[in-house]
Interface confidence: low
């Protein structure tokens, strides 16, 4: 008996074949020998089967001794054996249908578990396994599931049903909501504008939610909120707003925040959390502002830092075109009695340059200019 | 019958693309999905790719992720196979074929790149 | 990723002896094996699928066995024009990849 493998809501075709290649009659049964169609010379008749208004043939093969049964928008139960009579003959076809579908929603936040459910035919014993578009393969039964989804597991998840050594394929699109970035770091002189944005890993058509930001500045005790707002249709609206600092958010996405000036009292780190209507979970996007200011005191010269800076980091002051005056794996750095010219001030991670701060030093009976 | 017919062989400098297109004939377009195979001169087959026409979804060999793109049209029946970032190892027989679950029944007559500087 | 290995990668033989090749997967693969024949200058022909299945069309005297991780391609009685090479592939997950091959030359 010829197995053959189908995909709920899919079309299938069960072939059958005349050893004579023309029109003669035929017609298909189910197993319980109830009339699905046949001919009769040329027309095509219906029986008083379920499959009434979802059964067809191809009567262009007819001519050829062709005569497939095309069974439209499949359905679970409409697994069955199915027997074409042609020519004193049997042919019997065994469909099994199979359905695949995603737990609730196929829009999941990061960190959240998808389970997938195989809905299939009574007496069949399939086994399923599924690739992530990330290449990762799970293997199960009628349920699989992947706990604490990644953004790399947004995409077309591919299935493969395997039964009586056959197979059938679903393809089922994921899309897990994050932010294109866990975390992020701004490094800022004193006194710039400093640019915070929040890249959403996805796109939907409405997107409709509420966030806030707090803030926790390395020197202040506790953190705060800095930003409240809505999100509707991705229009964003601010609700409340710390007056200091003086933040301005964008009103479309992506999310995004100006701070007027970076100042060392605002260095410190950020949580942005985004909470989705009819989502269970928020989404976050960790933020990190570093600032650096150069200084000279009668005759000390200092650069600082402040803000959260890996131990790596090297803090360096030299004077232009020379090698560094000092180099430290810390938050401050000085020279005392600098010559004069052109100093600069750089944080660098493993010789490349995150911020540079440039201070000149006049001779001696000059007052510093800062460019 | 099932016919796939390719565009003709292409010669390119080393670093340019190649866009290999494979027509299908005499069969439902979007029921099955059009595998790419190329074959180096002298060497055995590699398995570079799939695309289903039904809803241009794709995969491919993890090696070629990032330079490979496939796309179709499904207005013509054909199915377009994007090589970028070419180099002299990328010198091949393109093959189209159709894919049955895994296997391919029905083949194009294959195109033969040549990356040369 | 699956990987098959092929054997022998070359062979000699006569018109008329029964020649076998063997395709071991590196997992198990079920069924969803496919073997090739493939003529210089032309595109592969497939010869079986689902591992012991004949394509339409394809002479009888060829024949596949095995499940799980080996597979066996025969041909019971070499005919001149099946002097080629043949190829092995697996069909259970992407990407299918291809044995190396095993060129089948006259003795």
């Known amino acids: 008996k010829k197995v053959v493998l189908g995909k709920k809501g899919d079309t299938v075709e069960l072939t059958c074949t005349a050893s004579q290649k023309k029109s003669i009659q035929f017609h298909w049964k189910n197993s319980n020998q109830i009339k699905i169609l046949g001919n009769q010379g040329s027309f095509l008749t219906k029986g008083p089967s379920k499959l009434n208004d979802r059964a067809d043939s191809r009567r262009s093969l007819w001519d050829q001794g062709n005569f497939p049964l095309i069974i439209k928008n499949l359905k679970i139960e409409d697994s069955d054996t199915y027997i074409c009579e042609v020519e004193d003959q049997k042919e019997e076809v065994q469909l099994l249908v199979f359905g695949l579908t995603a737990n609730s929603d196929t829009h999941l936040l990061q960190g959240q578990s998808l389970t997938l459910t195989l809905e299939s035919p009574p007496g069949s014993s399939p086994s399923v396994q599924c690739r992530s578009p990330r290449g990762k393969n799970i293997q199960g039964g009628k349920t699989l599931s992947v706990s604490q989804l990644e953004l790399q597991d947004s995409g077309t998840w591919t299935c493969t049903v395997l039964q009586n050594q056959k197979k059938v394929e679903f393809k089922i699109d994921i899309v897990v909501l994050a932010f294109q970035k866990a975390s992020s770091i701004v490094y800022k002189k004193e006194g710039e504008q400093v640019e915070f944005s929040f890249p959403l890993a996805f796109t939907v058509e409405k997107l409709t939610g509420s966030g806030e930001l707090w803030w926790q500045a390395e020197r202040a005790s506790s953190s705060k909120s800095w930003i409240t707002f809505d999100l509707k249709n991705k229009e964003v609206s601010v609700k409340r707003v710390t007056q200091d600092p003086k933040l301005q958010m964008g009103k479309k996405l992506p999310l995004h925040l100006t701070l007027p000036q970076a100042l060392p009292q605002y260095a410190g780190s950020g949580n942005l959390t985004l909470a989705l209507e009819a989502k269970t979970g928020k989404l976050h996007q960790e933020v990190n502002l570093v600032v650096m200011r150069a200084t000279q005191l009668q005759k000390n010269l200092t650069c600082e830092v402040w803000g959260p800076t890996s131990p790596k980091l090297m803090l360096s002051l030299k004077l232009e075109n020379k090698e560094a005056k000092v180099s430290k794996r810390e938050k401050a750095v000085w020279v005392l009695n600098p010559e004069a010219g052109m100093w600069q001030c750089l944080l660098s991670d493993s010789g490349q340059v995150l911020l540079e701060s440039n201070i000149k030093v006049l001779p001696t009976w000059s007052t510093p200019v800062q460019p | 019958q099932v016919q796939l017919v390719q565009s003709g062989a292409e010669v390119k400098k080393p670093g340019a693309s190649v866009k290999v297109s494979c027509k299908a004939s005499g069969g439902t377009f979007s029921r099955y999905g059009i595998a790419w195979v190329r074959q180096a001169p002298g060497q055995g087959l590699e398995w570079m790719g799939i695309?289903?026409?039904?809803?241009?979804?794709?995969s491919s060999a993890q090696k070629l992720q990032g330079r490979v793109t496939m796309t179709r049209d499904t207005s013509t029946s054909t199915v377009y196979m994007e090589l970028s970032s070419l180099r002299s190892e990328d010198t091949a027989v393109y093959y189209c074929?159709?894919?049955?679950?895994?296997?391919?029944?029905?083949w194009g007559q294959g195109t033969l790149v040549t990356v040369s500087s | 990723d699956i990987q098959m290995t092929q054997s022998p990668s070359s062979l000699s033989a006569s018109v008329g002896d029964r020649v076998t090749i063997t395709c071991r997967a590196s997992q198990s693969i079920s069924s969803w094996l496919a073997w090739y024949q493939q003529k210089p200058g032309k595109a592969p022909k497939l010869l079986i699928y689902a591992a012991s299945t004949l394509q339409s069309g394809v002479p009888s005297r060829f024949s596949g066995s095995g499940s799980g991780t080996d597979f066996t391609l025969t041909i019971s009685s070499l005919q001149p024009e099946d002097f080629a090479t043949y190829y092995c592939?697996?069909?259970?997950?992407?990407?299918?990849?291809f044995g190396q091959g095993t060129k089948v030359e006259i003795k």
């Open positions: 592939q697996q069909g259970y997950s992407t990407p299918y990849i």
């Open positions: 695309s289903y026409p039904s809803d241009g979804s794709t």
């Open positions: 074929a159709r894919d049955r679950l895994g296997d391919l029944d029905y």
